[in-house]
């Protein structure tokens, strides 16, 4: 069971300081942006991180949403990352969900975060280059100290 608590507005960056945004095709991508670029591209660069209480606590449970015309929420259904047109629900009556991630602070690096899927233990949000695009994907942590699964989260509230 997950029960919704508060939400905050955040900018998410990878460790190369590229900003996460949602493009016109609803794809989550990373791109180099100045602070003014980041502001100019809002609300596509502003993510709503909603915290949830967890009946079986395994870390800070969150959903990641974005509000452009409508609210879309990040999902990792079948280990494929996509934004689904939906509001983060008030309650989820299950111990796993494709839209719930555990936001983890990396020990020794308080400002570096990882997002582990609640549906697929050991799978994390990651940034991966594919041709000329830097995409948000779900990947199994396969090497120690993998920088691709680490992010910074800057609160905009």
């Amino acid at each position: 069971y997950f029960g919704k608590l508060e939400s905050k507005l955040s900018v998410i960056r990878n460790l190369n300081d590229q900003v996460l945004f949602i493009d016109q095709g609803n794809r989550p991508l990373f791109e180099d942006m100045t602070d003014s670029d980041c502001r100019d591209n809002a609300p596509r660069t502003i993510f709503i991180i909603s915290m949830y209480k967890d009946s079986q606590p395994r870390g800070m449970a969150v959903t990641i949403s974005v509000k452009c015309e409508k609210i879309s929420t990040l999902s990792c259904e079948n280990k494929i990352i996509s934004f689904k047109e939906m509001n983060p629900p008030d309650n989820i009556k299950d111990t796993k969900s494709d839209i719930i991630f555990f936001q983890r602070s990396v020990p020794g690096h308080d400002n570096k975060m990882q997002f582990e899927s609640s549906s697929y233990e050991g799978y994390f949000l990651a940034c991966e280059k594919e041709r000329d695009l830097f995409k948000l994907i779900l990947k199994k942590e396969d090497e120690l100290g993998d920088r691709s699964i680490m992010f910074t989260v800057q609160n905009e509230d």
Partner: antibody, heavy 119, light 110 residues
């Protein structure tokens, strides 16, 4: 750099209660869990329970259920552990520990508070 | 009361490699992650290894963790005098949301 600073040593009589505090500085207090772990003289570590300030949930080890109360005050970034019905076997160093990665991965520890229970 | 079993003591000469074992069961190590803590004399414990084999920043790569089945181990290579401490393994049980520690192993550097 996160720091956890605990209250000072206590001497208590059997049957009484003790309340130990743990003040956090640095980091975001309500985005991680605070556990309490004790260590009797010359013995190992024993988890007592924790609180997750952002959800308000507290969890207790079965052994301490009904005798321990863990609370948190977000306005002062302070967690508290109260243990009642004290007995001599409760003489120990009590540690608070922060868990920012997982509620049971203790990545920062307080300096410890010695609680002595003696008549 | 102690669910995870560790040897009470291990020793090694400077520069040597030592391992500390931690034995559990399917209800803890078999199905969950293992963490290791180092406790230097008179100080609070410190996180050494988390999630079986991850090192927090600042922990030398001389320390490594591994897990197989219902057992875990901590290896320390290039032993140094400052490694003399007590080492504790820890695992947890999601369903009961509780955690268990090993009894601790005292490492002596000869």
């Amino acid at each position: 750099e996160v720091q956890l600073v605990q209250s000072g040593a206590e001497v208590k009589k059997p049957g009484s209660s003790v309340k130990v505090s743990c003040k956090a500085s640095g980091g975001t207090f309500n985005s991680y869990a605070i556990s309490w772990v004790r260590q009797a003289p010359g013995q190992g570590l024993e988890w007592m329970g924790n609180i997750i300030p952002y959800s308000g949930f507290a969890y207790y080890a079965q052994k301490f259920q009904g005798r321990v109360t863990i609370t948190a005050d977000e306005s002062t970034s302070t967690a508290y552990m109260e243990l009642s019905s004290l007995r001599s076997e409760d003489t120990a160093v009590y540690y608070c520990a922060r868990a920012a990665y997982h509620p049971l991965v203790f990545d920062n520890w307080g300096q410890g508070t010695l609680v002595t229970v003696s008549s | 009361d102690i669910v995870l079993t560790q040897p009470p003591s291990v020793s090694g000469a400077p520069g040597q490699r030592v391992t500390i074992s931690c034995s559990g069961s399917s209800s803890n190590i078999g199905n969950h992650y293992v963490n290791w803590y180092q406790q230097l004399p008179g100080t609070a414990p410190k996180l050494l290894i988390y999630r079986n084999n991850h090192r927090p920043s600042g922990v030398p790569d001389r320390f490594s963790g591994s897990k197989s089945g219902t057992s875990a181990s901590l290896a320390i290579t290039g032993l140094q005098s400052e490694d003399e401490a007590d080492y504790y393994c820890q695992s947890w049980d999601y369903s009961g949301f509780s955690t268990v520690f090993g009894g601790g192993t005292k490492l002596t550097v000869l």
